[in-house]
Interface confidence: medium
């Protein structure tokens, strides 16, 4: 960052999107600012308009190509600059040498579905979205289940230390409404972080058979 009150953070979704957030104390809300991306060895550059997301932070997405196109690799370096208009000229407010595969945040898993549900267990599957083929199987997942009367923050995390796009939830209560979420993270990258949580999948366990203990 150009000065100490400025923070410029970007993540690569591993395919064709770099999402950036820039925050600066005391910056004017109505200033027009952009993120400029200049790769070190690619024949394109890209710009996105920073839009306010809070009082002192702005965000934008650099769309590098079609969603599943592999636009960057582990050896790329992309110079990212925040440029803000000052009268007739542009001023550089922040800069970073962005190494995409050191700063990964994948898209949230999609297509969650109940494969099989019983009284005490439920098998759920999902798919990863726009994830690079470079990862092969080097991904991990976290999942959580929302029980009645609890919050998501209280839900214990279940960790899947391999690329496993399903889970069998056990010890559930019969005839009970639950919600389920999952997120994904590549093993690669010093600053890599978890994807956003998936959209919650609601499901209900089967009622216990009459006359049987639960």
């Amino acid at each position: 960052a150009v000065n100490g009150t400025s923070r410029f953070t970007c993540f690569y979704n591993s395919r064709a999107n770099i999402s950036c957030v820039w925050s600066q104390d005391g910056a004017l809300q109505d200033t027009s600012c952009q993120v400029h991306a200049w790769p070190d060895r690619r024949r394109w550059n890209q710009t996105c308009e920073l839009l306010p997301v809070s009082q002192a932070s702005w965000a934008c997405n650099l769309i590098l190509g079609t969603p599943d196109s592999q636009k960057l690799t582990a050896v790329d370096i992309v110079t990212l600059r925040v440029m803000c208009r000052e009268g007739v000229r542009w001023r550089m407010m922040a800069i970073q040498d962005f190494k995409p595969f050191e700063n990964l945040r994948l898209m949230a898993p999609i297509s969650l579905q109940v494969v099989h549900v019983e009284t005490h267990r439920c098998n759920i599957s999902w798919k990863i979205s726009q994830a690079s083929h470079y990862f092969e199987r080097h991904l991990e997942f976290e999942a959580r289940t929302l029980s009645p009367g609890h919050t998501w923050e209280e839900a214990p995390l279940m960790t899947l230390k391999q690329k496993q796009e399903w889970i069998c939830l056990e010890t559930l209560t019969p005839d009970t409404q639950y919600e389920f979420q999952v997120r994904v993270k590549p093993l690669q990258g010093e600053f890599t972080t978890w994807s956003p949580w998936s959209q919650p999948l609601a499901f209900r366990t089967k009622p216990a058979a009459l006359g049987k203990d639960t």
């Epitope: 200049w38 070190d40 690619r42 050896v75 110079t79 800069i95 040498d97 190494k99």
Partner: antibody, heavy 119, light 106 residues
């Protein structure tokens, strides 16, 4: 006009250290990556490393740990700090910058500075 | 590292001759760069992105190729073309150069 001017070369004993400078003019070192390349007498070109616009560095594994690239933005100058020098480090050292886009190749070169490592 | 192998290592040709230099990469590269270095001088960029002529470079110089095989051509050799020519890849780090081809006049 873009210009690069190296200095700081000379004779140094094996195991010694030397710091080369590359004074840039006609552009800001915070806007372009600048690279160091060397050429041993009668030999080909060897890329040593680069310092990118944002200040991060990249090195050839052959010199990583012994050579350090840095810059002084206020002086618009790049540096190559060379430690634990060996006879095989004897070469002309160039700084170079790509064209307007990095992938344009090394469009701008300094005149080079000779480093001789010998006892 | 990607190894760049130039051939020939030296050649002698007459003024007006067509001169061709090849550069073989040890693995596929996206684009190739070619430089001219006259004795005692810094290298000069001639070709970037495989086939694009750098600013101020005469049109007798050209480049082509893809994958692992690239070619540099001087369509009509001139006395001022006496120099060593280098190929270079910028597909992966470390950046690497060919060992050079020395061009002389017969």
């Amino acid at each position: 006009e873009v210009q690069l001017l190296e200095s700081g070369g000379g004779l140094v004993q094996p195991g010694g250290s030397l710091r080369l400078s590359c004074a840039a003019s006609g552009f800001s070192v915070t806007s372009y990556g600048v690279h160091w390349i060397r050429q041993a007498p009668g030999k080909g070109l060897e890329w040593l490393g680069a310092i990118w616009s944002g200040g991060s560095t990249q090195y050839n594994a052959a010199v990583k740990g012994r050579f350090t690239i840095s810059r002084d933005n206020s002086k618009n100058t790049l540096y190559l700090q060379m430690n634990s020098l060996r006879a095989e480090d004897t070469a002309v050292y160039y700084c170079a910058r790509a064209g307007d886009a990095n992938y344009d190749g090394f469009a701008y070169w300094g005149q080079g500075t000779l480093v001789t490592v010998s006892s | 590292d990607i190894q760049m192998t130039q051939s020939p290592s030296s050649l002698s040709a007459s003024v007006g001759d067509r001169v061709t230099i090849t550069c073989q990469a040890s693995s596929s590269v996206s684009f190739m760069y070619w430089y001219q270095q006259r004795p005692g001088k810094a290298p000069r960029l001639l070709i970037y992105d495989t086939s694009n002529l750098a600013s101020g470079v005469p049109s007798r110089f050209s480049g082509s190729g893809s994958g692992t095989s690239y070619t540099f051509t001087i369509s009509s050799l001139q006395p001022e073309d006496i120099a060593t020519y280098y190929c270079q890849q910028w597909s992966t780090y470390p950046l690497t150069f060919g060992q050079g081809t020395k061009v002389e006049i017969k």
